[in-house]
Interface confidence: low
Amino acid sequence: SGVFQLQLQEFINERGVLASGRPCEPGCRTFFRVCLKHFQAVVSPGPCTFGTVSTPVLGTNSFAVRDDSSGGGRNPLQLPFNFTWPGTFSLIIEAWHAPGDDLRPEALPPDALISKIAIQGSLAVGQNWLLDEQTSTLTRLRYSYRVICSDNYYGDNCSRLCKKRNDHFGHYVCQPDGNLSCLPGWTGEYCQQPICLSGCHEQNGYCSKPAECLCRPGWQGRLCNECIPHNGCRHGTCSTPWQCTCDEGWGGLFCDQDLNYCTHHSPCKNGATCSNSGQRSYTCTCRPGYTGVDCELELSECDSNPCRNGGSCKDQEDGYHCLCPPGYYGLHCEHSTLSCADSPCFNGGSCRERNQGANYACECPPNFTGSNCEKKVDRCTSNPCANGGQCLNRGPSRMCRCRPGFTGTYCELHVSDCARNPCAHGGTCHDLENGLMCTCPAGFSGRRCEVRTSIDACASSPCFNRATCYTDLSTDTFVCNCPYGFVGSRCEFPVGLPPSFPW
């Protein structure tokens, strides 16, 4: 779509005569008829295929034509077309004499024609005017013309439609060739796709307007590149949404169980070595000269029975001294001057000669030890008591004295808050670090399953991976209690299992 524009500039008819040679009376009141049509090698009569236009009376005999375009007038003349401009044309301009005010062809005298010119040729679309002048025997016409595209049409043939817009169809302006030029922040064939905030994660973020970064569920941060950990995750992180991967030394579903009591609390005294043995549980290995659960008690150096072969120990300021029985000598009475002939083996031990009778060795019966079978076996030397329990010898047997919160032969059992069956209506009891928790059967809720519920949000089995479902009465929604190894509001995400504990 475009417009052929014709600007009439000057018409000369000095003698004021018609084409027939007859003079106009009183002068030639001149108007023009213009015909624009397709290219013809010889411009012939026929329909004006590209359009026609007529002017009012512009002057008498010879006159210059005012440019009326700024005032909305008829010069330049406009010949619009709604097709692709072919690049060639034929133009016919007729000058006519109007004796009266009626300019209709049927109202004019038969010989009212003053002059007629016809041109044809090539014309490219452009802003520049082509100036031309046509002369006949009695008249001269000076004019210029051009072809320009209509609003919203572009290109060499005015065939490319482009209408700038900033709406759902697109966000663009038009280049001189009709191609789209996206407004800042938009992209795509029709400039309909917003350009998200720079760095916005391709998978985890999206945008509905430029420079925006909206996060998909499970992601957060300005660029949607930070995962959201499981709700309640205390000492843990995530690499995918709803995870809770525990920091070193922490365990449990929410990474809130202290597995590194030694590092976090340093309970062992006097340079003892601390070993973690479970949640909030540890064992201290004392340095020589110390004892107690936390190695807080100083030992007499004789408490370790350093004197052998029945030697007696005496504490001294700078250590200890062994008083050896007859037949023994050395720092710890470890050397013997006896042989099997001296019956050195006590408590039924049998004597075996060594080194041709210069020495001997005792083979001790059960429950006795020492080079002369003089010592009862101490069943506590192997530290059998767990969780900091104290080992006590009781004749032929031994027993463990447990720290508060532990029980069992070897203090290996955590004292259970669940022992008194506190959960009502068949609820399952779970020991926690700071108390207990009841998992209620369908239809019951409350801290001890004591409340009967009317709406069972768990009826649809919303929890995955054999998680326990229970109803939150305040919101009529369900909560999933995940087994170890799973997280998420429906326990749908697997995680690495935390270390197992000894209780």
Epitope: C162, H168, F169, Y190, Q193
Partner: antibody, heavy 117, light 107 residues
Framework: EVQLVQSGGGLVQPGGSLRLSCAAS????????MHWVRQTIGKGLEWVSA???????YYPGSVKGRFTISRENAKNSLFLQMNSLRAGDTAVYYC???????????WGQGTPVTVSS | DIRLTQSPSSVSASVGDRVTITCRTS??????LAWYQQKPGKAPNLLIY???SLQSGVPSRFSGSGSGTDFTLTISSLQPEDFATYYC?????????FGQGTKVEIK
């Protein structure tokens, strides 16, 4: 009552051409964007082309260069010229109006196009 | 092109049931989504536009929700005349695209 009445469907051989028409009534046709949508057994509903109030046209890649949408506001008419037809163009074609909020409503009654040798 | 994925592809339900159909888009489209109902041999009929706006003349048992990439059509109490195929349409950007359809059948 707003109405869209379609015509011009039928059987055509592969590589052939067909022109679909849609006559609008009950509303000021020149003020609305118009669309063609087709429905195939295999691919379901598929948008084929659109023409704006200023005559601006839009096509998906599957028909670009083969289909031409046009309108004649003076006659309240919408057209779809389909050239170089393929078997995959076999469908029921609907002409659809959309207004300032860009929602497809109402739809014509549909016209079947079968491309087969 | 923006892809639309409807689920489920079909659902069997009884009169009075609550039926929910979801439509997920491959990229964010704000609220520029519509829902259509189509019965055999008929043209599609607009139910919901702009994700949640009820088209004039459509019963209030139909409702829509969602924005961005996840959208839902809900029929609160299924009526005999509601057994049909339902389509979602994104009108955010060219080319406009439809979901593959969800058929609601009588159980």
């Amino acid at each position: 009552e707003v109405q869209l009445v379609q015509s011009g469907g039928g059987l055509v051989q592969p590589g052939g051409s067909l022109r679909l028409s849609c006559a609008a009534s009950g509303f000021t046709f020149s003020m609305y964007d118009m669309h063609w949508v087709r429905q195939t057994i295999g691919k379901g509903l598929e948008w084929v082309s659109a023409i704006g109030t200023a005559g601006d046209t839009y096509y998906p890649g599957s028909v670009k260069g083969r289909f031409t949408i046009s309108r004649e506001n003076a006659k309240n008419s919408l057209f779809l010229q389909m050239n170089s037809l393929r078997a995959g163009d076999t469908a029921v074609y609907y002409c659809v109006r959309s207004g300032t909020t860009e929602w497809f409503d109402p739809w014509g009654q549909g016209t079947p196009v079968t491309v087969s040798s | 092109d923006i892809r639309l994925t409807q689920s489920p592809s079909s659902v069997s339900a009884s009169v009075g049931d609550r039926v929910t159909i979801t439509c997920r888009t491959s990229q964010g489209i704000s609220s520029w989504l519509a829902w259509y109902q189509q019965k055999p041999g008929k043209a599609p009929n607009l139910l919901i536009y702009a994700a949640s706006s009820l088209q004039s003349g459509v019963p209030s048992r139909f409702s829509g929700s969602g924005s961005g990439t996840d959208f839902t059509l809900t029929i609160s109490s299924l009526q005999p005349e509601d057994f049909a195929t339902y389509y979602c349409l994104q009108a955010n950007s060219f080319p406009y695209t439809f979901g593959q359809g969800t058929k609601v059948e009588i159980k």
